[in-house]
């Protein structure tokens, strides 16, 4: 699986999850997020050669097409597969609000 | 929606579905597929600017991060959203087989 356990431990050129820390205030300008100050959102990148964690029959066929026809511009792309939520604390006036934001952290990638 | 109805009628630089015809014999070497001779598999391509058909909270946040930090290499990618099957005819010996292959035709795209 192209997950954090594998990808963060290996120098992997092809499609894999990469670490990306986002500071809410500095990177997004979100001063309103009280906690956490930032989080590892991570992202997916790297080429998707034939059969690399193909998501659908289309991505397998497209990967094969791209391999057999290298001049082609069409190829699968490395995108998130499994995502996890992030819990944040913010204030509405003086009232603290705890909210779970879905699909905020990339845990693994696929070729789609 | 970034579907064939919209994308095939507009000169759209950003993420959209693009026409791609695959000839089974010429492009894949699949002489064994009797019918059809080929099909429009299509593919997704184009930049994913902030809020362009974002698939998840992560892709929205990543699109915003990428817009505010243009030097960043992390950005969402344009990938298939809706796919349709393709029915093919092939032979096992002299016995014809009709089979529906799932997820073979891209009908729309998203930024993931």
């Amino acid at each position: 699986a192209l997950d954090t356990n594998y990808c963060f431990r290996n120098l992997e050129e092809n499609c894999c999850v990469r670490p990306l820390y986002i500071d809410f205030r500095q990177d997004l300008g979100w001063k309103w997020v009280h906690e956490p100050k930032g989080y590892y959102a991570n992202f997916c990148s790297g080429p998707c050669p034939y059969l690399r964690s193909a998501d659908t029959t289309h991505s397998t066929v497209l990967g094969l097409y791209n391999t057999l026809n290298p001049e082609a511009s069409a190829s699968p792309c490395c995108v998130p597969q499994d995502l996890e939520p992030l819990t944040i604390l913010y204030y509405v006036g003086r009232t603290p609000k705890v909210e779970q934001l879905s699909n905020m952290v990339v845990k693994s990638c696929k070729c789609s | 929606a970034l579907d064939t109805n919209y994308c095939f009628r507009n000169l759209e630089e950003n993420c959209c579905v693009r026409p791609l015809y695959i000839d089974f014999r010429q492009d894949l070497g699949w002489k064994w597929v009797h019918e059809p001779k080929g099909y429009y598999a299509n593919f997704c391509s184009g930049p994913c600017p902030y809020l362009r058909s974002a698939d998840t909270t992560h892709s929205t946040v990543l699109g915003l991060y990428n817009t505010l930090n243009p030097e960043a290499s992390a950005s969402p990618c344009c990938v298939p959203q809706d796919l349709e099957p393709l029915t093919i005819l092939y032979y096992v010996g002299r016995t014809p087989k009709v089979e529906q292959l799932s997820n073979m035709v891209v009908k729309s795209c998203k930024c993931s």
Epitope: L51, T60, V61, L64, L68 | L28, W30, W32
Partner: nanobody, 118 residues
Amino acid sequence: EVQVVESGGGLVQPGGSLRLSCAASASVFSWSVMGWFRQAPGKQRELVAISSGDRETYADSVKGRFTISRDNAKNTVYLQMDTLKPEDTAVYFCNAYVPVGESRGDYWGQGTQVTVSS
């Protein structure tokens, strides 16, 4: 279940030759996409060559030295490796991608070791 079995690996001197064989289940071989991949220690698995019907392609690093061929009567795909170099040392894996039928999917062999050393 599709069976994929490699053979033919071994120790060879630089400049030498080896021929790897990969047998796959007869019921799916004729429409399978057959591929050879390799994985060197500490490196990622990489594509070496593909035979897709009557189309074939090679990794740049082996072009002109390796030849993939298939014998549909024997349900076997071969990888003829000539002018071998030390950097060709790796475990070589055969893959069968079956696009149709009840066995649809991709299947891997266990791998065969190729060592190029003097």
